[in-house]
Amino acid sequence: EQAPGTAPCSRGSSWSADLDKCMACASCRARPHSDFCLGCAAAPPAPFRL
């Protein structure tokens, strides 16, 4: 987990200010409104699951 302003999050993850850590972009399929998903825009959209 990275602190903001230091090294970026690893590939496939994005910084969450809400959670204060890097989060996996893969989780944006289930939780597309998470703050860090804005940083995952390069990933193609996937269907939301129940």
């Epitope: 496939g12 809400d18 959670l19 989060m23 996996a24 972009c25 893969a26 989780s27 399929r29 289930a30 939780r31 409104h33 990933a43 193609p44 996937a46 699951r49 129940l50």
Partner: antibody, heavy 119, light 111 residues
Framework: QVQLQQSGGGLVQPGGSMKLSCIAS????????MSWVRQSPEKGLEWVAE??????????HYAESVKGKFTISRDDSKSRFFLQMNNLRAEDTGIYYC??????????WGQGTDLTVSS | DIVMTQTPASLAVSLGQRATISCRAS??????????MHWYQQKPGQPPKLLIK???SLESGVPARFSGSGSGTDFTLNIHPVEEDDTATYYC?????????FGGGTKLEIK
Amino acid sequence: QVQLQQSGGGLVQPGGSMKLSCIASGFTFSSYWMSWVRQSPEKGLEWVAEIRSKSDNYATHYAESVKGKFTISRDDSKSRFFLQMNNLRAEDTGIYYCSSTYADYFHYWGQGTDLTVSS
Amino acid sequence: DIVMTQTPASLAVSLGQRATISCRASQSVSTSTYSYMHWYQQKPGQPPKLLIKYASSLESGVPARFSGSGSGTDFTLNIHPVEEDDTATYYCQHSWEIPYTFGGGTKLEIK
């Protein structure tokens, strides 16, 4: 340090009720989805129920085998959540774990609590 | 429901060798980008512990001896080189849809 501390469980007669509790600390509880997972020699690991966060309208989901019998709930102000189990049967016997997930995988786990349904 | 089939049910591997555990889902659990498959280790008397998420992403603090691969319906957990401490039961789990389901487990013994 993340902790999920469970309470409840024990011996209950068929048709009886039991409430399990889980108190969380060390992470942003209100942002996480919470689940109960049970384990038995017969069925292995089995996801039971999930309650999502406020931003997901506290949506709840249940395994087909417990729908109408079990109720999951949470109290974000006290970082705790619950599983109310009614009309218990022998097949509900097992170790019950509380677990947190942001999405997809079960990240943090409680220590587990035994439930035995027997007369 | 998606059925997760793990093989073998048990295996014995010599210290320092490679352990390979397979998990097959009854339908695809992958998008073009990510696979919604996760692996756990469980030791007697303890809850499961997350090892690998999204098929191949190592959880923080997990030794690099553990690796995961696969997509679609077929996934693999590799442990190399195995150590004494790896004696445990390993489970796969999908999060493609509700209900989330687990594999039946693979019990690993170190020779």
